[in-house]
C-alpha cells in the first residue's frame, strides 16, 4: 500500500504563437481545479475507462479575474498535493490523465458551472520510494508543469511497496533468509507468502497472495506448461485450461512506438527504445529539456538546454536506455545458489529458495536436524532438505521411538531360532551350523568353515550377535 502524490507547479499558455484566451474575465470570474486519474501500466488512456489505480480531485484554486488587455498569465493554483492512495502493489509503469477544470462563478442559475479546459495523458515508469519526477505536458495552447512520486505506507517498503517490515523479534538478528529493512535497520523483512499452491519452480510472487508465472508456464498456480505444438501460432494470450498459446496479434504489430522508436516484444507486452529527445512508454513525450528532468534512476542529464537541442542521459551503473529507464538484467549472471529463482526487484536482487535452503542467495542448507532429536540414542542424518534418524540397535521408526523386533526379518539362517535380547538378537543354531547368524556349516571332522569358532564356544551353542 502507498500513496501517489502529484504537485502542480504551473498551468498557463505554452510557448509559441497562438496564446490562449484567458479562461476567466471580469464578467465571468473563475477558479481552477485539477483531477488526476491513474491506471496500471498497460491500460488504455481513454478518459472514460475506469481509474483502476485511483483518482483524486484537488481543492479549488483562488478566484481569478482577467485584467483587460493583459496576456493570459500562469493561472493561480490550488494549494497542496493531489494524493491518490493505492491499496496493492505499485505497478512501476502507470498511465495518467490530468484534467484542468474551470469553475465559473458568475450569476448562473443553479450555482457554478464547470467546464474542462485541458486534458493531458501519458505513461511513465516510476519506482516507489524514489525522488520527485518532474514533467511538462502540453494540451493545445496550454502547458502544464508538474511533479509526481509514489511512496509506500508503513509497513510496506521497496520499489513496488511489496516488501513488509516488522519490528525485530530478537534484538540481534532477523530470522533465516530475512534481511534488515534498510533504512529501518531495527526492523526485519517479513516473509513473502505466495498464493497457496503456487508452483515453487515455475511461479513467484512480488506481493503476498500472488502467483505469477515464469515464461513457459501458465494457469492460476503456474502448473500448466505452455504447449505450442497444437497451436496455430506461438503467440497471443495463453489459455489457462489448455496451456496453449492462442493466436493473436503481436504487441509490436503496427509499431506502437511513436517518433521513430523501435519496438521489441517482452514476455508480457512490448518495449519501445526511443530516439534521443523522446521518452515515455510509446516514445510519445517530446520537447523535453534537462530542466524537465528526463533522466530516470539518478541519470545525469547533459546538453538539451532548449527543446530543439537533444539531451543525453548518462546512466548510473545498472541502468540503460535513452532515459536510463531500463534495468540491466543482473539475474543472467545466476547469482542464486542451489536452484534458487532470481528476481531483480530493482532495489535489490532477491532469490526465492527451494525447500531446504535459505539465505539471501539460498546459500544455507537448512539444518533439518536442529531441534529434532532422535530418541533412544539415534543420530540425525540430514540431506536434501529432509532429515532421518539412524536408530540404535533395537529401535526404529521416524524418531527411533518404536522398539524394533530384531527377529522380524528372520536373520538366523539354516533354521536357527531367533531370540530378542536387550543388546540385539541371539541365534540358536540348528545342529550342523554355527556363527552369529548360523551362516557357517560345521564340517564332519568337527572343524568349521571360516571363521573359526571363538574359544569357549562349541558348535551348536547360541551365538550372540552384537
Amino acid at each position: 500500500a502507498g500513496v501517489f502524490e502529484l504537485q502542480i507547479h504551473s498551468f498557463g499558455p505554452g510557448p509559441g504563437p497562438g496564446a490562449p484566451r484567458s479562461p476567466c474575465s471580469a464578467r465571468l470570474p473563475c477558479r481552477l481545479f485539477f483531477r488526476v486519474c491513474l491506471k496500471p501500466g498497460l491500460s488504455e488512456e481513454a478518459a472514460e475507462s475506469p481509474c483502476a489505480l485511483g483518482a483524486a480531485l484537488s481543492a479549488r484554486g483562488p478566484v481569478y479575474t482577467e485584467q483587460p488587455g493583459a496576456p493570459a498569465p500562469d493561472l493561480p493554483l490550488p494549494d497542496g498535493l493531489l494524493q491518490v492512495p493505492f491499496r496493492d502493489a505499485w505497478p512501476g509503469t502507470f498511465s495518467f490523465i490530468i484534467e484542468t477544470w474551470r469553475e465559473e462563478l458568475g450569476d448562473q442559475i443553479g450555482g457554478p458551472a464547470w467546464s474542462l479546459l485541458a486534458r493531458v495523458a501519458g505513461r511513465r515508469r516510476l519506482a516507489a520510494g524514489g525522488p520527485w519526477a518532474r514533467d511538462i505536458q502540453r494540451a493545445g495552447a496550454w502547458e502544464l508543469r508538474f511533479s509526481y512520486r509514489a511512496r509506500c505506507e508503513p509497513p510496506a517498503v521497496g520499489t513496488a511497496c511489496t516488501r513488509l517490515c516488522r519490528p525485530r523479534s530478537a534484538p540481534s538478528r532477523c530470522g533465516p533468509g530475512l534481511r534488515p529493512c534498510a533504512p529501518l535497520e531495527d526492523e526485519c523483512e517479513a516473509p513473502l507468502v505466495c498464493r497457496a499452491g503456487c508452483s515453487p519452480e515455475h511461479g513467484f510472487c512480488e506481493q503476498p497472495g500472488e502467483c505469477r508465472c515464469l515464461e513457459g508456464w501458465t494457469g492460476p498456480l503456474c502448473t500448466v506448461p505452455v504447449s505450442t505444438s497444437s497451436c496455430l501460432s506461438p503467440r497471443g494470450p495463453s489459455s489457462a485450461t489448455t496451456g496453449c498459446l492462442v493466436p493473436g496479434p503481436g504487441p509490436c504489430d503496427g509499431n506502437p512506438c511513436a517518433n521513430g522508436g523501435s519496438c521489441s516484444e517482452t514476455p508480457r507486452s512490448f518495449e519501445c527504445t526511443c530516439p534521443r529527445g523522446f521518452y515515455g512508454l510509446r516514445c510519445e513525450v517530446s520537447g523535453v529539456t534537462c530542466a524537465d528532468g528526463p533522466c530516470f534512476n539518478g541519470g545525469l542529464c547533459v546538453g538539451g538546454a532548449d527543446p530543439d537541442s537533444a539531451y543525453i542521459c548518462h546512466c548510473p551503473p545498472g541502468f540503460q536506455g535513452s532515459n536510463c529507464e531500463k534495468r540491466v538484467d543482473r539475474c543472467s549472471l545466476q547469482p542464486c545458489r542451489n536452484g534458487g529463482l532470481c528476481l531483480d526487484l530493482g532495489h535489490a536482487l532477491r532469490c526465492r529458495c527451494r525447500a531446504g535452503f535459505a539465505g539471501p542467495r539460498c546459500e544455507h542448507d537448512l539444518d533439518d536436524c536442529a531441534g529434532r532429536a532422535c530418541a533412544n540414542g539415534g543420530t540425525c542424518v540430514e540431506g536434501g532438505g529432509a532429515h532421518r534418524c539412524s536408530c540404535a540397535l533395537g529401535f526404529g521408526g521416524r524418531d527411533c521411538r518404536e522398539r524394533a523386533d530384531p527377529c522380524a526379518a528372520r536373520p538366523c539362517a539354516h533354521g536357527g531360532r531367533c531370540y530378542a535380547h536387550f543388546s540385539g538378537l541371539v541365534c540358536a543354531c540348528a545342529p550342523g551350523y554355527m556363527g552369529a547368524r548360523c551362516e557357517f556349516p560345521v564340517h564332519p571332522d568337527g572343524a568349521s568353515a571360516l571363521p573359526a569358532a571363538p574359544p569357549g564356544l562349541r558348535p551348536g551353542d547360541p551365538q550372540r550377535y552384537l
Partner: nanobody, 119 residues
C-alpha cells in the same frame, strides 16, 4: 565498498584476440558471482560470460566457443580471453560482481573498457 577495475581493452582486427582483466579490491568481502557484460552503442547491456553463484561458468550464445572466462581466486581477478573477434563484438565491456559484504549482498559494476573490432 568494492572496486572493480577492468583493463585490456583496445582496438583489434577481425579474427584477432584480446584478454580482458577485472581486479576486485576492497576490504572484508567475498565474491558470490562475477562476470562480464557488454554494451554496444544504442544497445542493451547484456551478459557475455560469468561465474555463477554456484561457481559454474556461463556464456552468452553468441560467444560460446570463442570466449573463455577464467579466474585467479588468490588475486580476486577474473579474465576474459576473447578470440576470433568479430565487428559485432565491438562494445564497452563491463565487469560485474555480486559481492557479500558482512551478511549482505551488493552488486557492483566496473567503469568499463572499450573493445573495438575493425579492419
Amino acid at each position: 565498498e568494492v572496486q572493480l577495475v577492468e583493463s585490456g581493452g583496445g582496438e583489434v582486427q577481425p579474427g584477432g584476440s584480446l584478454r580482458l582483466s577485472c581486479a576486485a579490491s576492497g576490504s572484508d568481502f567475498s565474491i558470490n558471482a562475477i562476470g562480464w557484460y557488454r554494451q554496444a552503442p544504442g544497445k542493451q547491456r547484456d551478459m557475455v560470460a560469468g561465474f555463477t553463484g554456484e561457481g559454474v561458468t556461463t556464456y552468452a550464445e553468441s560467444v560460446k566457443g570463442r570466449f573463455t572466462i577464467s579466474r585467479d581466486n588468490a588475486k580476486n581477478t577474473v579474465y576474459l580471453q576473447m578470440s576470433s573477434l568479430r565487428a559485432e563484438d565491438t562494445a564497452v565491456y563491463y565487469c560485474a560482481a555480486d559481492v557479500k559484504i558482512g551478511g549482505d549482498y551488493e552488486w557492483f559494476w566496473g567503469q568499463g573498457t572499450l573493445v573495438t573490432v575493425k579492419p
